[in-house]
Interface confidence: low
Amino acid sequence: WELTILHTNDVHSRLEQTSEDSSKCVNASRCMGGVARLFTKVQQIRRAEPNVLLLDAGDQYQGTIWFTVYKGAEVAHFMNALRYDAMALGNHEFDNGVEGLIEPLLKEAKFPILSANIKAKGPLASQISGLYLPYKVLPVGDEVVGIVGYTSKETPFLSNPGTNLVFEDEITALQPEVDKLKTLNVNKIIALGHSGFETDKLIAQKVRGVDVVVGGHSNTFLYTGNPPSKEVPAGKYPFIVTSDDGRKVPVVQAYAFGKYLGYLKIEFDERGNVISSHGNPILLNSSIPEDPSIKADINKWRIKLDNYSTQELGKTIVYLDGSSQSCRFRECNMGNLICDAMINNNLRHADEMFWNHVSMCILNGGGIRSPIDERNNGTITWENLAAVLPFGGTFDLVQLKGSTLKKAFEHSVHRYGQSTGEFLQVGGIHVVYDLSRKPGDRVVKLDVLCTKCRVPSYDPLKMDEIYKVILPNFLANGGDGFQMIKDELLRHDSGDQDINVVSTYISKMKVIYPAVEGRIKFS
């Protein structure tokens, strides 16, 4: 018996087609992805093949103005239209709190939404009961397939799930649910979830009875043969893991942003054992036409976005200096504003020991592309912010050793004075440079804001300590020459859309007046 699994993950609000790098589509003839194009390909496969499942491994939420405006209603609407068979909850599904998940998505979705390792407690337990499930048994042709969901256990530190959801260890939580499916005589089981490729592989190895793992969170690109675009494969598709009980378990992921549709064919024997598995992600390029009915629907929903982008988010009563003459040479107040917004966006439920889990931000000055003039009545719009942060990146959470941070700050000024983009703007950090010293030895003072304290204060950076830092995904991936970050990071979790972070902060503050306040000094 043959099953075709079509899968997406980490779509992050890319409902419209995008450029090859998943930013805003500029030249339509070379654009990719989007739900209209995805629908065309899915329907093509559904017509051609008998047993097809369309699955999403989480993080539909967060990433473009679509999510900012529609807050998840767009996800339910278009996933319903594409007739998804199941979705696993990702960490970003909690970005607007549990209510922001329940109302627009859980109550509106016509497909099961799954996570076995999220347990509700307190008053939420009854409110959310039945709106998401640990597993679902789906009829496919003459057979049944069990889908069991999972979500990153780090979600409380990456998003806003509140205090009434407990995120258990994935493997611990999945095993009893898989066992339950087995007792129901379900012998073909897919683990669908959002914890990253390393955990996906562990699930394949450790959870007895899981036949296939369809994952997300780490934006992993797997491919067999010559890849069709710029993404470099992290391994073959499917990636085969030998389980502890000796089975070959295929593990798949489909990069991110709706650029590819994962396509996996599995052959099962009559006892539900995987006999063979093969496939590849399908690049959704312009050779695949956009479905006209979905496209028309997109255009209808688009109108509200155009109106939103010119509306006032808040006001500035000072000039927001995002000029390259400032931000690539010294502390600039636009950098301070953005970093303050990045930290504010990562305020999480603190316990008695920590006022917050992260206090530090770094931001490459070259990523700040425009100032905002306060003389236009002080008005700040989404459109203004899109000029400051035009690349459609995310502000991510990483864990770095102090020694790596020190290297990053040395790199920040290793060729100072040439208007290069690597000069770092900061938050929760006080740095002093001595440019008379040789490159690689110019940081003379580096103090960081404590997290394990009731009154935050600045302490000298400890080389061996592990610190959490918020930074652009561009830096996490080694951009602007920050190879040491990419090479030495101990953990990397993708965060929220950059413009959304800043716009939310400005809306919250209403009136802003960021200053240059001595975060970066030269001795």
Partner: antibody
Framework: QVQLQESGPGLVKPSETLSLTCTVS????????WSWIRQPPGKGLEWIGY???????NYNPSLKSRVTISVDTSKNQFSLKLSSVTAADTAVYYC???????????????WGQGTLVTVSS | DIQMTQSPSSVSASVGDRVTITCRAS??????LAWYQQKPGKAPKLLIY???SLQSGVPSRFSGSGSGTDFTLTISSLQPEDFATYYC?????????FGGGTKVEIK
């Protein structure tokens, strides 16, 4: 599943260095925190310290000046060295994995079966 | 360091009894508490984590509750294999610390 096995001498002389190794089988050492915990005969449990699979460490302040924990990823092993031992260091020494990676959420599971180290001349 | 105080230090009970063990932290630890069972000559075994989550494979007669500084482990109906020493452990901050243990003995 992951299994842990402690090994090392059962008898160490006072003032010498106690050395133990924990071998991890059935899983990679790289993505977890690995701890040493000890239990003097008839007494309670004391956490000694951890090492992350990629090398960072954290030690109990009460033992910090005497403890070194290291990792050898190629052998899937991590080790404990405790210097200047006295009779008070006589204990069953356990190695254990922290079941979750979050720095706020660390429980120990699984554990090795433990090895008794006696400090005596 | 956070001190963990368990009470009682020992309890005598019969098969079928309901047994309750308490653990108090010297400062708030939210829900970052685990309970372990240890039998003579064996390593501790994780029973409960995050104050109330049952570890996979642990019988449902074990349950945990509490938050902040006061926590409870309950064995709803004591079985012969439950006679052992039980330890609590805080997972809130370093150094990790354990309670002194509660020995559950046969009456």
């Amino acid at each position: 599943q992951v299994q842990l096995q402690e090994s090392g001498p059962g008898l160490v002389k006072p003032s010498e260095t106690l050395s133990l190794t924990c071998t991890v089988s059935g899983g990679s050492i790289e993505r977890y925190y690995w701890s040493w915990i000890r239990q003097p005969p008839g007494k309670g449990l004391e956490w000694i310290g951890y090492i992350y699979g990629r090398g960072s460490t954290n030690y109990n302040p009460s033992l910090k000046s005497r403890v070194t924990i290291s990792v050898d990823t190629s052998k899937n092993q991590f080790s404990l060295k405790l210097s200047s031992v006295t009779a008070a260091d006589t204990a069953v020494y356990y190695c254990a994995r922290e079941s979750q990676e979050s720095p706020y959420n660390n429980w120990f599971d699984p554990w090795g079966q433990g090895t008794l180290v006696t400090v005596s001349s | 360091d956070i001190q963990m105080t368990q009470s009682p230090s020992s309890v005598s009970a019969s098969v079928g009894d309901r047994v309750t063990i308490t653990c108090r932290a010297s400062q708030g630890i939210s829900s970052w508490l685990a309970w372990y069972q240890q039998k003579p000559g064996k390593a501790p075994k994780l029973l409960i984590y995050a104050a109330s989550s049952l570890q996979s494979g642990v019988p449902s007669r074990f349950s945990g509750s509490g938050s902040g500084t006061d926590f409870t482990l309950t064995i709803s109906s004591l079985q012969p294999e439950d006679f052992a020493t039980y330890y609590c452990q805080q997972g809130n901050s370093f150094p990790r610390t354990f309670g002194g243990g509660t020995k559950v003995e046969i009456k």
